[in-house]
C-alpha cells in the first residue's frame, strides 16, 4: 500500500458534525474523539484531513507566507496550496522559500526556459547545449488537479 | 495517560518461539492501530508489525513475514507478537507502540518501555 | 522499501546553538501537499519520542526550539537552542508506503 493509492477527495460531501468511526477511522476532513466513538468535522479554513485517519486533531492549515500567493484555499480535506509570485520560484533544496529568478543568463549562455514558480530560468551554452552548472533543475508540480477519491479503510 | 506495558522477553534458543504482550491503558485501546518495533542492542529502529482496531488489517515487513504473528484481544487491551523460527538477528527491545493511522499505518505516536528478546544457543 | 539517510551520523553542539539533522529519502514521500515523514527522540536507556509528524506538525507537548521542514525527499530537523536534555539520538521515520522504515540515527551531543 502507499499514500499515492489513498488519494483524498476534492470537496467533501455535505456531512453532520459527527458521524461513526469505520474500524477505527474516520474519513477526510474529520478527526476521531478522545473517546474514538465519534467522527468530528475539521473546522473549515482553520484545520483539514486529507486522508481516512484517527488523529486526534485536525491538521492547522498552512498559512501562505509574504511573497507567495494562494493558488486555492485550505477545505477541510484539503491544506492550502501555496505558490511563489511571479519573478520566485521554489528551490528543490530549500523548499521554505521563494528566491528570485535570474534576469537574464551568463555572457555565451542563451535561455531556453523561462522563470515558473517551481524553476529558476534554464540557461545553456551557446555551442555544446549543456546546463549551466549553476542552473536549479525544474521541479516537478506537486500540486495535481484531478485528486480522485479517497479509498476507504477496508479496501 | 497512555500507559504500554510490554512483557514475555528473555532467552530463546535459535529456530524457538516466544510471544511477547502489551498491556495497554489510558486511551480507547478498541479505535485504535496498534503495532510493535524493535530495537537490536547499539543499533537503529525496525518496525515489525502492525494491526488495525478490530484485527482485519494486518501489516508485516518481508524481513518477519510469515514468522511472526501480530494479534489483539479488545476484551482484555491486550496487545500481542507471536514469534516463531527465531534468528539470532531477532534480539532486540521489542517496544508496544499506538500508531496513528493516516492513510496509511503513519507514525508511532506512544511507546512502551521495551522488553528484551536475546535469541543464542 | 524506502531508504532513509540521515546526516550527519553524529552532531556535537554548543548549549543554545542550533543544530541540524538531515534525512534524505531515497524516493519522494509527498501527496496531495503532505510528506509522510516524522521525526523522533531517543535519549538513553528511554524508548523512542516521537517530536514532529507530517514533515513539520509538533506533537503536543514538545517544545517549540524543535521544528521540521523540507519535501519530497529532502528533510530536517532543527534544534534551535540546544539545551542539555536535548541530546539524544535522532530518527527520521517514513509512512509514505510499506514497509514503514526509519534513518539510522543521528547522535546529539554537547560540544
Known amino acids: 500500500i502507499t499514500q499515492q493509492d489513498l488519494a483524498p477527495q476534492q470537496r467533501a460531501a455535505p456531512q453532520q458534525k459527527r458521524s461513526s468511526p469505520s474500524e477505527g477511522l474516520c474519513p477526510p476532513g474529520h478527526h476521531i474523539s478522545e473517546d474514538g466513538r465519534d467522527c468530528i468535522s475539521c473546522k473549515y479554513g482553520q484545520d483539514y484531513s486529507t486522508h481516512w485517519n484517527d488523529l486526534l486533531f485536525c491538521l492547522r492549515c498552512t498559512r501562505c507566507d509574504s511573497g507567495e500567493v494562494e493558488l486555492s484555499p485550505c477545505t477541510t480535506t484539503r491544506n492550502t496550496v501555496c505558490q511563489c509570485e511571479e519573478g520566485t520560484f521554489r528551490e528543490e533544496d530549500s523548499p521554505e522559500m521563494c528566491r528570485k529568478c535570474r534576469t537574464g543568463c551568463p555572457r555565451g549562455m542563451v535561455k531556453v526556459g523561462d522563470c515558473t514558480p517551481w524553476s529558476d530560468i534554464e540557461c545553456v551554452h551557446k555551442e555544446s547545449g549543456t546546463k549551466h552548472s549553476g542552473e536549479v533543475p525544474a521541479v516537478e508540480e506537486t500540486v495535481t488537479s484531478s485528486p480522485g477519491t479517497p479509498a476507504s479503510p477496508c479496501s | 495517560e497512555v500507559q504500554l506495558v510490554e512483557s514475555g522477553g528473555g532467552l530463546v534458543q535459535p529456530g524457538g518461539s516466544l510471544r511477547l504482550s502489551c498491556a495497554a491503558s489510558?486511551?480507547?485501546?478498541?479505535?485504535?492501530?496498534m503495532s510493535w518495533v524493535r530495537q537490536a542492542p547499539g543499533k537503529g529502529l525496525e518496525w515489525v508489525a502492525a494491526?488495525?482496531?478490530?484485527?482485519?488489517?494486518?501489516h508485516y515487513p518481508d524481513t518477519v513475514k510469515g514468522r511472526f504473528t501480530i494479534s489483539r484481544d479488545n476484551a482484555k487491551n491486550s496487545l500481542y507478537l507471536q514469534m516463531n523460527s527465531l534468528r539470532a538477528e531477532d534480539t532486540a527491545v521489542y517496544y508496544c507502540?499506538?500508531?496513528?493511522?493516516?492513510?496509511?499505518?503513519?507514525?508511532?505516536?506512544?511507546w512502551g518501555q521495551g522488553t528484551l528478546v536475546t535469541v543464542s544457543s | 522499501n524506502i531508504v532513509l539517510t540521515q546526516s550527519p551520523d553524529s552532531l556535537a553542539v554548543s548549549l543554545g546553538e542550533r543544530a541540524t539533522i538531515n534525512c534524505r529519502a531515497s524516493e519522494s514521500v509527498d501527496i496531495y501537499g503532505n510528506s509522510f515523514m516524522h521525526w523522533y527522540q531517543q535519549k538513553p536507556g528511554q524508548p523512542p519520542k516521537l517530536l514532529i509528524y507530517?514533515?513539520?506538525n509538533l506533537e503536543s507537548g514538545v517544545p517549540d526550539r524543535f521544528s521540521g521542514s523540507g519535501s519530497r525527499t529532502d528533510f530536517t530537523l532543527t534544534i534551535s537552542s540546544l539545551q542539555a536534555e536535548d541530546v539524544a539520538v535522532y530518527y527520521c521515520?517514513?509512512?509514505?508506503?510499506?514497509?514503514?522504515?526509519f534513518g539510522g540515527g543521528t547522535k546529539v551531543e554537547i560540544k
Open positions: 507502540t499506538r500508531l496513528t493511522y493516516y492513510g496509511n499505518p503513519a507514525w508511532f505516536a506512544y
Open positions: 494491526i488495525n482496531s478490530n484485527g482485519g488489517r494486518i
Open positions: 507530517l514533515s513539520s
Open positions: 489510558g486511551l480507547p485501546f478498541n479505535s485504535y492501530y
Open positions: 521515520q517514513q509512512s509514505y508506503e510499506d514497509p514503514l522504515t
